[in-house]
């Protein structure tokens, strides 16, 4: 697995997407976990609804929310109010029994708000870094979903 970098700015929201083969992972719950070291387990942060058919419903643990579009094959994780300690190495996982398949390895990068509030004339937003070749960067700063909002309503 290559690592995908998602950059966000402190205090804002970051949306991480993990595409997958919807047929291959049919019926499987998904999870978002954090790798705290080079070795050791990936610590579960949040997982989708216990009932797979309700995976479109948003589940939340603190400032982290997860929802799964099982038909389109996209797992979406939203980190609200990004803080420096949210930065780290994460994985999107597909669960089956006690096993977990890695859907995507994700590096979340939290940058300090570059807008110096003492001099508001120098607005800067994250741009693609030129210093690395082996990582795909996505800048995905977005609002968090509202309470009760269903991001992927079931189709009739």
């Amino acid at each position: 697995h290559n690592t995908t970098v998602f950059q966000g700015v402190e205090g804002q929201s970051l949306q991480v997407s993990c595409p997958y083969d919807s047929m291959k992972h049919w019926g499987r719950r998904k999870a978002w976990c954090r790798q705290l070291g080079e070795k050791g387990p990936c610590q579960r942060v949040v997982s989708t609804h216990n009932l797979w058919l309700l995976s479109f419903l948003r589940r939340r643990n603190g400032s982290t929310a997860i929802t799964d579009d099982t038909l389109g094959g996209t797992l979406t994780i939203t980190l609200r109010n990004l803080q420096p300690h949210d930065a780290g190495f994460y994985q999107c996982q597909s669960l089956h029994g006690s096993e977990a398949d890695t859907l995507r390895k994700v590096l979340v990068e939290v940058l300090a708000d570059p807008l110096d509030h003492r001099d508001a004339g120098d607005l800067w937003v994250p741009g693609e870094s030129e210093s690395f070749e082996d990582a795909h960067v996505e800048h995905s700063i977005s609002r968090s979903l509202l309470e009760g909002e269903i991001p992927f309503p079931p189709t009739s």
């Epitope: 970098v5 950059q7 402190e10 790798q35 705290l36 070291g37 080079e38 803080q83 420096p84 300690h85 930065a87 780290g88 190495f89 590096l107 990068e109 940058l111 300090a112 708000d113 994250p126 870094s129 030129e130 210093s131 690395f132 990582a135 960067v137």
Partner: antibody, heavy 120, light 107 residues
Framework: EVQLQQSGPVLVKPGASVRMSCKPS????????MNWVKQSHGKSLEWIGS????????SYNQNFRGKATLTVDKSSSTAYMELNSLTSEDSAVYYC?????????????WGQGTLVTVSA | DVQLTQSPSFLTASPGETITINCRAS??????LAWYQEKPGKTNKLLIS???TLQSGIPSRFSGSGSGTDFTLTISSLEPEDFAMYYC?????????FGSGTKLEIK
């Protein structure tokens, strides 16, 4: 064993610039954030900023924006900090300090410091 | 910026005693606080992270507690090598900030 080797002391004139280096060993350079910290004589510690060597993404203390520039050279696994338009206020010891795995949950390893003296 | 008020600034104690150093944040920083030891001629040492997590290789006489705004570093049964400068640091939000330091001197 993890070590952070910093470049030696420098004496510079006001208005000049200086670039110091931090060469880590004992771990994978790109896996850990690198931070820079200032300590003026007899004073506390002041965080300047941090850089993610994997992406080159950096964050700065607003007090040092325009003063400090953080860079990395992945080919030599070395972190650099450049300070410009130096004044006597910039005379201090500057430390590099390694963060945690792709994050900054405390600075587990520190360099020995680089003493910068600004004097005419 | 989050201000960290460290107290006391100076502390004298004897080997074998137990001491506490306090660190108060100007706003809640949850558990995101670290404690460091600074000694002349040595590189700074991370003692505690996440408010209470002892780093590997650090003696168990060091302990940290607290969350939110009030934190404490406790050193029980002081050893001669413990007399040094101690700093707290928050990494809850940018810019990371340090306390003003506590100098622990031998009585």
């Amino acid at each position: 064993e993890v070590q952070l080797q910093q470049s030696g002391p420098v004496l510079v004139k006001p208005g000049a610039s200086v670039r110091m280096s931090c060469k880590p060993s004992g771990y994978t350079f790109t896996d850990y954030y690198m931070n820079w910290v200032k300590q003026s004589h007899g004073k506390s510690l002041e965080w300047i900023g941090s850089i993610n060597p994997y992406t080159g993404g950096s964050s700065y203390n607003q007090n040092f924006r325009g003063k400090a520039t953080l860079t990395v050279d992945k080919s030599s696994s070395t972190a650099y900090m450049e300070l410009n338009s130096l004044t006597s206020e910039d005379s201090a010891v500057y430390y590099c300090a390694r963060g945690s795995y792709y994050s900054n949950l405390g600075f587990a390893y520190w360099g020995q410091g680089t003493l910068v003296t600004v004097s005419a | 910026d989050v201000q960290l008020t460290q107290s006391p600034s100076f502390l004298t104690a004897s080997p074998g005693e137990t001491i506490t150093i306090n660190c108060r944040a100007s706003k809640s920083i949850s558990k995101y606080l670290a404690w460091y030891q600074e000694k002349p001629g040595k590189t700074n040492k991370l003692l505690i992270s996440s408010g209470s997590t002892l780093q590997s290789g650090i003696p168990s006489r060091f302990s940290g507690s607290g969350s939110g705004t009030d934190f404490t570093l406790t050193i029980s049964s002081l050893e001669p090598e413990d007399f040094a400068m101690y700093y707290c640091q928050q990494y809850s939000e940018y810019p990371f900030t340090f306390g003003s330091g506590t100098k622990l001197e031998i009585k």
